[in-house]
């Protein structure tokens, strides 16, 4: 989690701070959404359970050329213990369901807020 505070982070970021920063970024994306996010790109829906940070990254990493979610992709990689590359899929994907990136972000944001409220940071 060291790098989650941004590139100029002075040291390890507490998990609660890292999660808050991810929430802040997703709120920022939601608030600033004028045109369809990532041109309405579709991604695999995921089960919001244990391991969902990697699953979320695996879904979003397949969206290319969308600067709005680049920071989110970087932040999610800090929560995922293994390296994720495009085309990778975990069992957490709901493989028959694709949703717009905007809906994906909303669903993820709600879940992360609940985790933050419950004190589940990792």
């Amino acid at each position: 989690l060291t790098c989650l505070g941004g590139f100029a982070s002075p040291g390890p970021v507490p998990p609660s701070t890292a999660l808050r920063e991810l929430i802040e970024e997703l709120v920022n994306i939601t608030q600033n959404q004028k045109a369809p996010l990532c041109n309405g790109s579709m991604v695999w829906s995921i089960n919001l359970t244990a391991g969902m940070y990697c699953a979320a990254l695996e879904s979003l990493i397949n969206v290319s050329g969308c600067s709005a979610i680049e920071k989110t992709q970087r932040m999610l990689s800090g929560f995922c213990p293994h390296k994720v590359s495009a085309g990778q899929f975990s069992s957490l994907h709901v493989r028959d369901t694709k949703i717009e990136v905007a809906q994906f972000v909303k669903d993820l944001l709600l879940h992360l807020k609940k985790l933050f409220r419950e004190g589940q940071f990792n």
Partner: antibody
Framework: QVQLVQSGAEVKKPGSSVKVSCKAS????????MHWVRQAPGQGLEWMGT????????KYVPKFQGRVTITADESTSTAYMELSSLRSEDTAVYYC??????????????????WGQGTLVTVSS | DIVMTQSPLSLPVTPGEPASISCRSS???????????LEWYLQKPGQSPRLLIY???DRFSGVPDRFSGSGSGTDFTLKISRVEADDVGIYYC?????????FGQGTKLEIK
């Protein structure tokens, strides 16, 4: 507009069970926590437990553990509280309440911002 | 369980005068995420409770600015700058930081 409408008053025998419903409208229950709070006649408020309707996760007060079951049905936007092995001390008004989350605030835990009208459960032989 | 103790239990106030209710928790109620989930509710006679203040000092929408919350750690206060006749009822503090979440025993505000 936001509403929580609870089922009607119940009279129950000691040892039996009661199931109170709370029908939500004006919002998606998956975006909330749904809570249950009770109030015995002339007494204060007592939090009983909560459910996250998005995944069914529950938290209960230990004194009710094993006797209370909180559930939620996303398809009907309804939360339920079932209390078993009823005794006279369970005579109370039972309230449901929600805590909502939205997309536009970083930390928007709005506490129990809307409440149902209450359901009187009377336990008497 | 965390015990929330309110004082006074009864509070007679003259309209236009200020009022203050204290709430003390038996242990620190700072949540692991850094927030303090201390709330205040008002229950008017024959009605369901309604939210006034959350996270110590955040006023819920529609709540008059005559109501304010303050405090930290284990000591919290609800202040009404100028009491109105409509403010009568029972005021409850509540902690939502540590399960099981708990209410104070209530403070009955009445008009002198």
């Amino acid at each position: 507009q936001v509403q929580l409408v609870q089922s009607g008053a119940e009279v129950k025998k000691p040892g039996s069970s009661v199931k109170v419903s709370c029908k939500a409208s004006g919002f998606y229950i998956k975006d909330t926590y749904m809570h249950w709070v009770r109030q015995a006649p002339g007494q204060g408020l007592e939090w009983m437990g909560t459910i996250d309707p998005a995944n069914g996760n529950t938290k209960y007060v230990p004194k009710f553990q094993g006797r209370v079951t909180i559930t939620a049905d996303e398809s009907t936007s309804t939360a339920y509280m079932e209390l078993s092995s009823l005794r006279s001390e369970d005579t109370a008004v039972y309230y449901c309440a929600r805590s909502i989350y939205d997309d536009y605030h970083v930390d928007d835990y709005y506490a129990m911002d809307y409440w149902g009208q209450g359901t009187l459960v009377t336990v008497s032989s | 369980d965390i015990v929330m103790t309110q004082s006074p239990l009864s509070l007679p106030v003259t309209p236009g005068e200020p009022a203050s209710i204290s709430c003390r928790s038996s242990q620190n109620i700072v949540h692991i995420n850094g927030n303090t989930y201390l709330e205040w509710y008002l229950q008017k006679p024959g009605q369901s409770p309604r939210l006034l203040i959350y996270k110590i000092s955040d006023r819920f929408s529609g709540v008059p600015d005559r109501f304010s919350g303050s405090g930290s750690g284990t000591d919290f206060t609800l202040k009404i700058s100028r009491v109105e006749a409509d403010d009568v009822g029972i005021y409850y503090c509540f902690q939502g930081s540590h399960v099981p979440w708990t209410f104070g025993q209530g403070t009955k505000l009445e008009i002198k």
